[in-house]
């Protein structure tokens, strides 16, 4: 199944327009903005969710833009090109014709430049940092208690393989879950680091891109976990290229 | 050829304590995760424990109450099961049974089995 | 926790015949159902994952369909072989489970 036949919805894009024209009158679903359709036994990429989310009425966005704490991803949202496949085109350029490269969750590698700028490639983000910091609690989690829960949690709730979830680190309050995940390593089928890394961010902000499933509702031992804030670095198989200018 | 194969299961008195083995061949014990499931006489399946080896990671039915422990020793392919305070109701054939590898947690691969029983 | 309800308890076919077993979830489990055959004094053998998916080794005559939280599992024309309990079981979560599996359905095959 794609999608749920029964009332023709996509659970793991609610950001999707789905209609029973699939062959046989089957359910198929079709991201917003882009007009592609969607495996709805998996999660979207996020390319398409970046374009669907800009894709919105301005005055009907629920979703907000990303706060001052991303140090990483700070170019905001921008309307992406995605490729046939949903992935990130390695080139984006906006309105005015500036144009960037990205890694293959979209963030910016290069300095900004014209229509000349040249990028040959898709370079893959490998390794992802989720640092969060939690809200206080009577007592420190449990380390291996919360180790496993957030692997059951990218386990069932994004499909990412615990192989995937590298390690785990935790020193109260903050938390660290480290992605990894190489272009050799990444089978067909495989969820993709990045686009499990982007659900889980909406997830923690209350912005759930999940259709009829709850919230995200994190528990410990049956304590609550409440994230106050979420830091997400990024490293690329090839490191990025940015001009001594910026780094000054 | 893969293979599970559990033993340490026998005749154990109420109150009492057993530890069952399950030993994996022909596979890498850490590609998977692997669970305990028994079966009491004439009953269905009842799932206890799963154990993710690599990490360590546990999970118990809601029912376990922290009387059964689940583990692994990863060099030797064995994944374990205490049995602690055991009553007549844990009276049951042991499996021990091995996800698909995927996401989700089917079994695809079950030992035959290890019979305990708990009588005075 | 998602609960699992098995109908029928027991069922009889004939040989050549249609048999259809069904599982309940109480909660939506999407896709992520598994069904397993018995025998006696044996442990059991998976049939069906993600709710259609034949496992390797496994007949056609054996389907499963269904999607959210109703099931079903159809044996195609019964053979002898195939007298056995049947199982359900959840493979969405872990979490707070008490018991993924079913009660299970005896096919008696006449």
């Known amino acids: 199944h794609t999608a749920a036949q029964d009332n023709c919805t996509c659970p793991t894009n609610k950001m999707t327009v789905c209609s029973p024209d699939g062959p046989g009158g089957r359910c198929q679903c079709r991201a917003l903005g882009s007009g592609v359709a969607v495996d709805c036994s998996t999660l979207t990429s996020k390319c398409l969710l970046l374009k669907a989310r800009m894709s919105a009425p301005k005055n009907a966005r629920t979703l907000v833009r990303p706060n001052e704490h991303a140090l990483v991803d700070n170019d905001g949202l921008y309307d992406p090109d995605c490729d046939p496949e949903g992935r990130f085109k390695a080139r984006q350029c906006n309105q005015t014709s500036v144009c960037w490269c990205v890694n293959s969750v979209g963030v910016r590698r290069t300095d900004k430049g014209d229509l000349s700028l040249r990028c040959d490639e898709l370079v893959r983000t490998h390794h992802i940092l989720i640092d969060l910091r939690h809200r206080p609690t009577a007592s420190a989690f449990n380390h291996s208690d919360l180790d496993a829960e957030l692997r059951r949690l990218f386990r069932e709730r994004y499909r990412l393989h615990p192989k995937f979830v590298a390690a785990v680190h935790y020193e109260q309050p903050t938390i660290q879950i480290e992605l990894r995940q190489n272009t050799s390593q990444k089978a067909a089928g495989d969820v993709d680091i990045g686009d499990a890394a982007y659900y889980f961010e909406r997830d923690v902000k209350g912005e759930s891109l999940f259709q009829g499933r709850g919230g995200l509702d994190l528990r410990v031992r049956g304590e609550p976990l409440q994230v106050e804030r979420t830091l997400i670095y990024y490293l690329d198989e090839i490191p990025p290229k940015f001009s001594m200018k910026r780094l000054t | 050829q893969e293979q599970l194969k559990e033993s340490g299961g026998g005749l154990v008195q109420p109150g009492g304590s057993l530890t069952l083995s399950c030993k994996a061949s022909?596979?890498?014990?850490?590609?998977?995760?692997v669970s305990w499931v028994r079966q009491a006489p004439g009953k269905g399946l009842e799932w206890i424990a799963y154990?993710?080896?690599?990490?360590?990671?546990?999970y118990y039915a809601t029912w376990v109450n922290g009387r059964f422990t689940i583990s692994s020793h990863n060099a030797q392919n064995t994944l374990y099961l205490q049995l602690n305070t055991l009553t007549a109701a844990d009276t049951a054939t042991y499996f021990c049974?091995?996800?698909?590898?995927?996401?989700?947690?089917?079994?695809?691969?079950w030992g035959p089995g290890t019979l305990v029983t708990v009588s005075s | 926790d998602v609960v699992m309800t098995q109908t029928p308890a027991s069922v009889e076919a004939a040989v050549g015949g249609t048999v259809t077993i069904n599982c309940q979830a109480s909660?939506?489990?999407?896709?992520?159902l598994a069904w397993y055959q018995q025998k006696p004094g044996q442990p059991p053998k998976l049939l069906i994952y993600?709710?259609?998916k034949l496992a390797s080794g496994v007949s056609s005559r054996f389907s499963g369909g269904g999607y959210g939280t109703e099931f079903t599992l159809t044996i195609s024309g019964v053979e002898c072989a195939d007298a056995a309990t049947y199982y359900c079981?959840?493979?969405?979560?872990?979490?707070?489970?008490?018991?993924?599996f079913g009660g299970g359905s005896e096919v008696v095959v006449k």
């Open positions: 909660q939506s489990i999407e896709s992520y």
């Open positions: 154990i993710y080896p690599t990490y360590h990671n546990t």
């Open positions: 022909g596979f890498d014990f850490n590609n998977y995760g």
């Open positions: 079981q959840q493979a969405l979560t872990i979490g707070n489970v008490d018991n993924p």
């Open positions: 049974a091995r996800d698909a590898g995927g996401t989700d947690y089917n079994f695809n691969l």
């Open positions: 993600e709710a259609s």
